[in-house]
């Protein structure tokens, strides 16, 4: 197979014919050294998936349900290119499956038993697979056959295409369960009409259905969406209140050696030459031979799927949960309203050991999952492999953009017993220099910098945000002569000062000696000119408070703070000499797990929090000899957030604005994936 050939998998004679036409037309517009198309014909999409996994083909376009099959072992395929719909300016690559109800009804998602339901059709994504998959474990046993369990769960339904003889309740609201538009309650508009007419109490449809059927906002205001957290939202808040986000149609490839760049190059060229309204002789998004061949006829173009986005992230936790429930038919033994153990995400082996110790002391109420970077941990929480972790504000922002919510805040200044209910204002992000140097905020260019990690608040977002507004470009590695900013590109000058050891050099975890607050300060002590840290870092690591060899003889008076007005002050005066106020670190979780995480952590801190005095012979949650493992060591307690329960409210408008501005300089692959 030529190096630059993309073997496209076709699943019918008509598709194979279109594929050959695609191949020939691409040959005529691409240079001879450019990508080319080869066609492979298989009997079904599942056969195509297997062929790609076996390296007999390279690409195929799939619906969401098949993307799930493609991702499962042993196939291990991943999404590489998405079809988009709508306009180029506002491309839609996903739709949202929603549960619509009338505003004057008073039930929530967990109160659907005994209600009347309207569905688009049996086996369809938004109308059946997703809602029934998510409700699966609430269905009465036996859950097989599924139609019977659903019929016994709702008091009456319209499920077009269901068997009305075997399951009459499923056709109670639409006699015969007609499988075409002859049934007035068929498909999206039909299911909505079923609700609108008062036949049903809830309609399972797409987010766009309401807008397509009710042009008038006043009419739409008579309806609401049911959210998975048992609240309701208005119909235009579907992004924050849906059953699942469903990818429309996606090109998949192998996860390893999958030619994704080549596939993108090919499809990008293809849409330029043969996309919507581009060419008379060949159209990518239509065909004289049939409907939706190779690509959907309704597609307007392609978007490259960000490289960090694997199939789990692409399909989303809710969608995977729903499909897995339906396919595997397994439910937890515990009732769903009971809290299962919370899986904490630990960064590399130091945190994992502390987490294991916590797990033992919690009698298994805490379990541990590991990842090598904070972003990998956030991704694990998103997809359900982990449940929670405590994050610096910069990562609370990324986690929030990825759909996670803050649950509890670390408090550093409030003494018990008021701590748990106090909302602290935050800590100060400061720039620390040696007293012996002549540095000021205005002459940092060309100096050696030490950062906690890329993307963190005090170590990166605040100082680099201020710097950006001064220099108006993102080339921070050119501004400083060298530095250590864990998480930077390995060949960057901002990895040059890092200490490693070798394979972990510049990694954003505790294996890198200059990682985190203590690490950045150590970098200043040993190699750097300026360290960007929290205001407590110097006092916590001087005067013998840190027994490590590099720190045990350090004196607080040998360090000073840089003020934004060009002056310097003692490290005792952060309130009058700081870069900005930073939001405290906070625990984040998925929305569905937030209540359990909060309840469990409040209980755990009562046992292992700052009330424990002897940490040498007892487990202490907020202690790790200045290494800030799992939580900052200066945490007094984890505090309730009250109404600051979204990332925007928690971080505050000013900080969110600052980080959003800095996104032009973002090196976060996860953020790119979550904003796709």
């Amino acid at each position: 197979v030529p190096e630059k050939s993309v073997r496209w998998c076709a699943v019918s004679e008509h598709e194979a014919t279109k594929c050959q036409s695609f191949r020939d037309h691409m040959k005529s517009v691409l240079p001879s050294n450019g990508p080319s198309v080869a066609c492979v014909k298989k009997a079904s999409h599942l056969d195509c998936i297997r062929a790609i996994a076996a390296n007999e083909a390279d690409a195929v376009t799939l619906d969401a349900g098949l993307v799930y099959d493609a991702y499962l072992a042993p196939n291990n395929l991943k999404p590489v290119v998405a079809e988009f719909y709508g306009s180029k300016e506002d491309p839609q690559t996903f739709y949202y499956a929603v549960a619509v109800v009338k505003k004057d009804s008073d039930f929530q998602m967990n109160q659907l038993r005994g209600r009347k339901s309207c569905h688009t059709g049996l086996g369809r994504s938004a109308g059946w697979n997703i809602p029934i998959g998510l409700l699966y474990c609430d269905l009465p046993e036996p859950r097989k056959p599924l139609e019977k369990a659903v019929a016994n769960f709702f008091s009456g339904s319209c499920v077009p295409c269901a068997d009305g003889t075997d399951f009459p309740q499923l056709c109670q609201l639409c006699p015969g369960c007609g499988c075409s538009t002859l049934n007035q309650y068929f498909s999206y508009s039909g299911a909505f009409k079923c609700l609108k007419d008062g036949a049903g109490d809830v309609a399972f449809v797409k987010h766009s259905t309401i807008f397509e059927n009710l042009a008038n906002k006043a009419d739409r205001d008579q309806y609401e969406l049911l959210c998975l957290d048992n609240t309701r939202k208005s119909v235009d808040e579907y992004k924050d209140c849906h059953l699942a986000r469903v990818p429309s149609h996606t090109v998949v490839a192998r996860s390893v050696g999958g030619k994704e760049d080549l596939i993108w190059e090919l499809l990008n060229q293809a849409q330029e030459h043969f996309g919507k309204d581009k060419s008379k002789e060949f159209q990518l998004f239509s065909s004289p031979h049939g409907k939706d061949l190779l690509f959907k006829d309704s597609a307007h173009g392609f978007l490259k799927v960000p490289p960090r986005m694997d199939a789990k992230m692409y399909l989303g936790y809710e969608y995977i949960t729903a499909i897995r429930n339906l396919r595997e038919g397994t439910c937890p033994e515990a009732p769903t309203d009971e809290c299962k153990p919370v899986k904490w995400c630990a960064l590399s082996h130091h945190e994992r050991l502390k987490c294991d110790e916590w797990s033992v002391n919690s009698a298994g109420k805490i379990e541990c999952e590991s990842a090598e970077t904070t972003e990998d941990c956030i991704a694990k929480i998103m997809n359900g492999e982990a449940d929670a972790m405590s994050l610096d504000g910069g990562f609370v922002y990324i986690a929030g953009m990825c759909g996670l919510v803050p649950v509890l805040a670390e408090n550093y200044n409030t003494p018990n017993p008021n701590c748990e209910n106090t909302a602290e204002e935050g800590y100060f992000a400061v720039a620390v220099v040696k007293s012996s140097s002549d540095l000021t905020w205005d002459n940092l260019k060309g100096k050696k910098s030490c950062h906690t990690a890329v993307g963190r608040t005090a170590g990166w977002n605040i100082p680099m945000g201020l710097l950006y507004s001064k220099i108006n470009h993102c080339r921070f590695d050119e501004f400083f002569s060298e530095g250590c900013a864990p998480g930077s590109e390995k060949n960057s000058s901002l990895c040059k000062l890092c200490m490693g050891p070798s394979p972990n050099l510049c990694e954003p975890n505790n294996k890198e000696g200059y990682y985190g607050y203590t690490g950045a300060f150590r970098c200043l002590v040993e190699k750097g000119d300026v360290a960007f840290v929290k205001h407590q870092t110097v006092p916590q690591n001087t005067g013998g408070k840190n027994p490590d060899a590099w720190a045990k003889n350090l004196k607080e008076e040998d360090y000073e703070l840089l003020c934004l007005d060009g002056s310097r002050k003692s490290v005792q005066e952060p309130a009058n000499c700081h870069l900005a106020r930073a939001p405290n670190h906070a625990v984040v979780a998925r929305k569905d797990k937030a209540d359990c995480v909060q309840t469990l952590l409040l209980d755990q801190q009562r046992m292992f929090g700052s009330s424990v005095t002897d940490c040498s012979s007892n487990f202490c949650l907020f202690e790790s000899k200045t290494k800030d493992l799992l939580f900052r060591d200066d945490t007094v307690c984890l505090a309730k957030l009250h109404d600051r329960n979204t990332y925007e409210k928690y971080l505050g408008e000013e900080y969110v604005k600052a980080v959003t501005n800095l996104r032009k300089c973002s090196t976060s692959p996860l953020l790119e994936a979550c904003t796709f």
Partner: nanobody, 117 residues
Framework: QVQLVESGGGLVQPGGSLRLSCAAS????????MAWYRQAPGKQRELVAG???????NYRDSVKGRFTISRDNAKNTMYLQMNSLKPEDTAVYYC???????????WGQGTQVTVSS
């Protein structure tokens, strides 16, 4: 820092039993938490069982009901009684006291357990 030495491993048939010991060179009385880990070839080291100073225990799901962890503070020793052994229990077993957890990635030699017919 307390030095720990593991012993008691060996070759055993599926369904058989072994008792591992972990002897400490100093007093373990004041150590908050002790644990057994294991590492199979090509796999990550994983927590098998742990015991707190007060004697409460915790086990990974796959060994619950088969393994029992205990500690004898007077003898400065921790034990792992392993019954109904399975081939998937084959690994090198290590004990740790967590006391030096934040400074060193220190592990002893471990003791090899092989379950095979």
């Amino acid at each position: 820092q307390v030095q720990l030495v593991e012993s008691g491993g060996g070759l055993v048939q599926p369904g058989g039993s072994l008792r591992l010991s972990c002897a400490a060179s100093g007093s373990i009385f004041s150590i908050a938490t002790m644990a057994w880990y294991r590492q199979a070839p090509g796999k990550q080291r994983e927590l098998v069982a742990g015991i707190t100073r007060s004697g409460s225990t915790n086990y990974r799901d796959s060994v619950k009901g088969r393994f029992t962890i205990s500690r004898d503070n007077a003898k400065n020793t921790m034990y792992l009684q392993m019954n109904s052994l399975k081939p998937e229990d084959t690994a090198v077993y290590y004990c740790t006291d967590y006391s030096s957890r934040y400074y060193h990635d220190y592990w002893g030699q471990g003791t090899q357990v092989t379950v095979s017919s």
